[in-house]
């Protein structure tokens, strides 16, 4: 059974994951982002179901494509590079989903834009956090 300390750690990790996903989304939605139109042409796979931590496997499998799309930003001056954000997200996802059981991700038939994709995983984090608090 999960202890209060492990629940607290999970909650904190989810909060950090949520913050970085929101940061990526904010940067993409920035009205000054000239690459937004191109970014929106890329399609992402959405999970058929995302209600448990094991479903983060579906996010993990889309992190490389996400980084590639974020690289389109090509800012001369990054405070954080896309690879910094994706690396941190990957570490959190691996810790949260665990490696004990192998979960085969099932994807929905419809693909999504980067904005829809990020919003889906932001909602996922918020939903899980709400069950822990």
């Amino acid at each position: 059974a999960p202890t209060s300390s492990s629940t607290k750690k999970t909650q904190l990790q989810l909060e950090h994951l949520l913050l970085d996903l929101q940061m990526i989304l904010n940067g993409i939605n920035n009205y000054k982002n000239p690459k937004l139109t191109r970014m929106l042409t890329f399609k992402f796979y959405m999970p058929k179901k995302a209600t448990e931590l094991k479903h983060l496997q579906c996010l993990e499998e889309e992190l490389k494509p996400l980084e590639e799309v974020l690289n389109l930003a090509q800012s001369k001056n990054f405070h954080l590079r896309p690879r910094d954000l994706i690396s941190n997200i990957n570490v959190i996802v691996l810790e949260l989903k665990g490696s004990e059981t192998t979960f085969m991700c099932e994807y929905a038939d419809e693909t999504a834009t980067i904005v829809e994709f990020l919003n889906r995983w932001i909602t996922f984090c918020q939903s899980i956090i709400s069950t822990l608090t």
Epitope: L19, D20, M23, S75, L80
Partner: nanobody, 119 residues
């Protein structure tokens, strides 16, 4: 408007350590990047290290393994632990607050704190 107050600079011998702190106040959003840039005399301002509210970090190659950036989200404070300092680390260190992972005109900057590494 965001206000940034830096502290912790000073004079230190080569090989020594310093810890910089920067507290942000005002219109703070939970989603942000805070970090440190530096500017040596006659040189351009350059990134030292940055950290997102979610914990993503970026370090300049020249400080990797020597400097560690951390933050306390509850206190809106960012820290830079600087170890094994070298004379070439001498510069004015500026705290930065940004709402995005890339630079734009909405970024905020502190007044700067002098770090001098000299024997």
């Amino acid at each position: 408007e965001v206000q940034l107050v830096e502290s912790g600079g000073g004079l230190v011998q080569p090989g020594g350590s310093l810890r910089l702190s920067c507290a942000a106040s005002g219109s703070i959003f939970s989603i942000n990047v805070m970090g440190w840039y530096r500017q040596a005399p006659g040189k351009q301002r350059e990134l030292v290290a940055a950290i997102s509210s979610g914990g993503s970090t970026n370090y300049a190659d020249s400080v990797k393994g020597r400097f560690t950036i951390s933050r306390d989200n509850a206190k809106n404070t960012v820290y830079l632990q600087m170890n094994s300092l070298k004379p070439e680390d001498t510069a004015v260190y500026y705290c930065m607050y940004a709402s995005s992972w890339y630079e734009d005109e909405t970024d905020y900057w502190g007044q700067g704190t002098q770090v001098t590494v000299s024997g």
